[in-house]
Interface confidence: low
């Protein structure tokens, strides 16, 4: 009796299952009690000798390429051997590499975690993922794993991490790069500083007083609100960052505490209060303002 080994599929792709079947065309295996064993090159596969004429291999990899055969043994210890069958496992080259961010959109708060997720739409076997910073490509990290995605984590984002990033995936057919992804690091405003600017050392009634508010840190645009006591005087925007000013024509009622607030949508911060008092210097006829 002749023995044949049949692999299904006969040309497997990496990562896919394969069923090996030991066939006896002119003899039903039920006619006699047989034990079966499957081999690759010189090594027995799976459980060794078994009553099943089939062997299921859950996933085939490139390194599983080789020469396979089977043997059948009767109760009378007669051993039948099949011819060798060459099984070539095909690797799928990586394709369609993309870089995504968590949080999505590439906008991240300073101090928060940023994850750069490199993905391939297809590709089998060990895939090497590499992450690069900047268009010139400062190498950040590489990972090799049997998966279609890999992650690079920046546990606590700093201002200096605001850059363009890309990743490259490779599984033996040459590197395949993703597109560039821009990371914007959003910085909450720092506590603003309120400065008072007058046309002369001692401002008088009817002078124009400039209230200048500036947060030294914070992503633009920044909206500044100006307050006299707890009354809102008005607001000014700084679309590109920096400070903003509010002009006030002085009257005697303008004594009191002044403050400002900076808000860039990531949080608001209020300045320390600055106190203005009208004084009447000895021998002077006009009221003067001091801070």
């Amino acid at each position: 009796a002749e023995l044949f080994l049949i692999a299904s599929p006969s040309h497997p792709t990496e990562g896919s299952p394969v069923t090996l079947t030991c066939k006896m065309p002119f003899l039903q295996s039920s006619d006699a009690q047989f034990q079966f064993c499957f081999f690759r090159d010189t090594r027995a596969l799976g459980p060794g000798w078994s009553s099943s004429p089939k062997l299921q291999i859950a996933a085939m990899w490139k390194e599983d390429t080789g020469s396979y055969w089977c043997e059948a043994q009767t109760m009378a210890s007669k051993v039948l051997r099949s011819r060798r069958s060459q099984i070539n496992v095909h690797r799928v080259p990586v394709a369609d590499v993309s870089l995504e961010t968590q949080p999505p959109g590439g906008q991240v708060m300073e101090g928060d975690r940023l994850v750069l997720i490199c993905s391939v739409a297809m590709g089998t076997g060990d895939i090497t993922f590499l992450w690069y910073k900047g268009a010139v490509g400062l190498n950040l990290q590489s990972k090799t794993q049997r998966s279609l995605t890999a992650e690079y984590e920046i546990p606590s984002v700093r201002e200096s991490d605001a850059e363009q990033y890309y990743c490259v995936a490779e599984n033996g057919y040459g590197p395949s790069p993703s597109g560039l992804v821009s990371i914007t690091v959003r910085i909450p405003v720092s506590r603003p500083i309120l400065m008072l600017r007058a046309p002369r050392a001692q401002a008088a009634v009817e002078d124009v007083l400039e209230l200048h508010c500036e947060a030294l840190r914070g992503s633009p645009p920044i909206l500044y609100w100006f307050y006299h006591e707890d009354i809102t005087l008005g607001s000014r925007s700084a679309p590109s960052g920096g400070g903003a000013s509010f002009n006030l024509s002085l009257t005697e009622e303008h004594s009191g505490n002044y403050s400002c607030e900076a808000n860039n949508g990531l949080g608001a911060q209020r300045s320390e209060a600055v106190t203005l008092n009208f004084t009447v210097p000895t021998g002077a006829r006009s009221n003067h303002l001091t801070s």
């Epitope: 928060d112 950040l140 920046i154 546990p155 606590s156 200096s160 991490d161």
Partner: antibody
Framework: QVQLQQPGAELVKPGTSVKLSCKAS????????MHWVKQRPGQGLEWIGR????????KYNEKFKSKATLTVDKTSSSAYMQLNSLTSEDSAVYYC??????????WGQGTSVTVSS | DIVMSQSPSSLAVSVGEKVTMSCKSS????????????LAWYQQKPGQSPKLLIY???TRESGVPDRFTGSGSGTDFTLTISSVKAEDLAIYYC????????FGSGTKLEIK
């Protein structure tokens, strides 16, 4: 101001489990990872794991993977750590700690767990 | 895991003296993307929780007196107390956060 409130002590029997709490206040709870650290009497500090209060995703020190389970309740701004199959080796002070810029900037007062029959 | 080694394990100094303690990591804590060292120093006084002193190896935490200074890069780090006060009696731990956090075994500072 930022505060992490933990109960002072728990006395538990061997083989049982205990759920430790950590109530956060004074900041946006979901913006910062919460870590847990173990300190046995007279010993150093040992990292147990961390949880992202926003997603609930957690990572553990391999040594504590089958010992500790981290959870959060966003509505009450609380983090929890359940310790199971307690033995005398688990007798320690357990701290919850907030992480900012990678470092642990605020710590709870710690909960002292005593495992005794 | 990254192993953190601290030395000495304890030291006794007089008030006003300068103190340095060392921390070494089994691999570099310098992060190429931002040129920061992922190392922190903590102070734990008797019966209290640890308190953050220094992060990014050399950035002093808000409210920490300027007599505490962190220095070093890569694998070798130092915490210096320029003029010890009696209230500095504590155990000092270094910790890396380049990977899952690990702590050194601590340096116990005693006052003579």
């Amino acid at each position: 101001q930022v505060q992490l409130q933990q109960p002072g002590a728990e006395l538990v029997k061997p083989g049982t489990s205990v759920k430790l709490s950590c109530k956060a206040s004074g900041y946006t709870f979901t913006r910062y990872w919460m870590h847990w650290v173990k300190q046995r009497p007279g010993q150093g500090l040992e990292w147990i794991g961390r949880i992202d209060p926003n997603s609930g995703g957690s990572k553990y020190n391999e040594k504590f993977k089958s010992k500790a389970t981290l959870t959060v309740d966003k509505t009450s701004s609380s983090a929890y750590m359940q310790l199971n199959s307690l033995t005398s080796e688990d007798s320690a002070v357990y701290y919850c700690t907030r992480v900012n810029s990678g470092a642990m900037d605020y710590w709870g007062q710690g909960t002292s767990v005593t495992v005794s029959s | 895991d990254i192993v953190m080694s601290q030395s000495p394990s304890s030291l006794a100094v007089s008030v006003g003296e300068k103190v340095t303690m060392s921390c070494k990591s089994s691999q570099s804590l310098l992060y190429s993307s931002n040129q920061k060292n992922y190392l922190a120093w903590y102070q734990q006084k008797p019966g209290q929780s640890p308190k953050l002193l220094i992060y990014w190896a050399s950035t002093r935490e808000s409210g920490v007196p300027d007599r505490f200074t962190g220095s070093g890069s890569g694998t070798d780090f130092t915490l210096t107390i320029s003029s010890v006060k009696a209230e500095d009696l504590a155990i000092y731990y270094c910790q890396q956060y380049s990977n899952y956090p690990t702590f050194g075994s601590g340096t116990k500072l005693e006052i003579k």
